[in-house]
């Protein structure tokens, strides 16, 4: 006879699962802040930069009080997938000026990818309904000029920074209710 079966796998502690997700999010937030500061030092921003293809910020005045875990994770995953796509686009089409942000931009992409996988795992561990497969997104048009690429980088890093702050605040708030 084979070895006795091991103990049944303990059901995940949702607080511990959330904790490790928050840790990754905070870590990515720090990376994003550092990279945004680096970008500002090299190419000072003249006011706010927007990019129409970026997701709108998930948090509004009343939204944080009414958060539910499935909604937060689904929204966060969708937004971060969009930011991952934008970071990949920036690295590919951003032009020579943005090459000075390597290898940090590559590290950011890898960590963003890791957080997305962590969110996917969290959703399956907590037996939350899995979102449908993402529809193919229309390709992002290359920036019209070198300065266009820099403006896009400001918008992407600024938006990602705010989205990750929303995520940390939302996830920690939800943790207090578990």
């Amino acid at each position: 006879p084979g070895p006795p079966p091991g103990p049944p796998r303990a059901s995940p502690d949702p607080r511990a699962e959330l904790d490790s997700t928050v840790l990754l999010t905070r870590s990515l937030l720090a990376d994003t802040r550092q990279l945004a500061a680096q970008l500002r030092d090299k190419f000072p921003a003249d006011g706010d930069h927007n990019l129409d293809s970026l997701p709108t910020l998930a948090m509004s005045a009343g939204a944080l009080g009414a958060l539910q875990l499935p909604g937060v994770l689904t929204r966060l995953r969708a937004d971060l997938l969009s930011y991952l796509r934008h970071v990949q686009w920036l690295r590919r089409a951003g032009g020579s000026s943005l090459k000075t942000l390597e290898p940090e931009l590559g590290t950011l992409q890898a960590r963003l990818d890791r957080l997305l996988r962590r969110l996917q795992l969290l959703m399956s561990r907590l037996a939350l309904p899995q979102p449908p497969p993402d529809p193919p997104a229309p390709p992002l048009a290359p920036p019209s000029s070198a300065w266009g690429g820099i403006r896009a980088a400001h918008a992407i890093l600024g938006g990602l920074h705010l989205t990750l702050d929303w995520a940390v605040r939302g996830l920690l708030l939800l943790k207090t209710r578990l």
Epitope: L23, L29, L164, W166, R169
Partner: antibody, heavy 119, light 111 residues
Framework: EVQLVQSGAEVKKPGASVKISCKAS????????MDWVKQAPGQRLEWIGD????????IYNQKFTGRATLTVDKSASTAYMELSSLRSEDTAVYYC????????????WGQGTTVTVSS | DIVLTQSPASLALSPGERATLSCRAS??????????IHWYQQKPGQAPRLLIY???NLESGVPARFSGSGSGTDFTLTISSLEEEDFATYYC?????????FGQGTKLEIK
Amino acid sequence: EVQLVQSGAEVKKPGASVKISCKASGYTFTDYNMDWVKQAPGQRLEWIGDINPHSGGPIYNQKFTGRATLTVDKSASTAYMELSSLRSEDTAVYYCARGELGHWYFDVWGQGTTVTVSS
Amino acid sequence: DIVLTQSPASLALSPGERATLSCRASKSVSTSGYSYIHWYQQKPGQAPRLLIYLASNLESGVPARFSGSGSGTDFTLTISSLEEEDFATYYCQHSRDLPPTFGQGTKLEIK
């Protein structure tokens, strides 16, 4: 110079409300959260909540939920805290403080606003 | 909520001496290399001032005689050689979870 300047001292009667302002200057207002902290005589500092000026999204310490309301006026780089249904235990110095996004440490503080609740 | 306990409640030392202030958390405030403890100094009639963030990072403009250490539940703020202006009350604060909470403070007095 990075500065947070708060409104002046207030004396209120029990049951009333108070609204304190905090004007930020010397930095991009939307790059940091604005937090509010209470310091009552002989008590430890107590976090009330924070607000993200970019979106106007507040979060609260459960102890203050329902009585504290945090708002911002982005165009004036000003944050506000309103505290309702005042009682004697609300007598304290209230501080606004600039909070690092996602980390809740406070690197710049207002000078404090003294609120006295007395009948 | 996480409770932070500071010791001693008060400490009397002379200028030039080394001060060691302790902060203990009711549960771990560290995760994978990050320790979510911050230290502040407060003088009478003034707002708190950030000295150390994330356990060991010196805030810009703070003298190098201040340092922070520790992980898990036990943290220390050290002032290597006390100056006259260091006599004040010191608070630790965590931001591991919501809500962030503060210790009750250690009052550092001149002997």
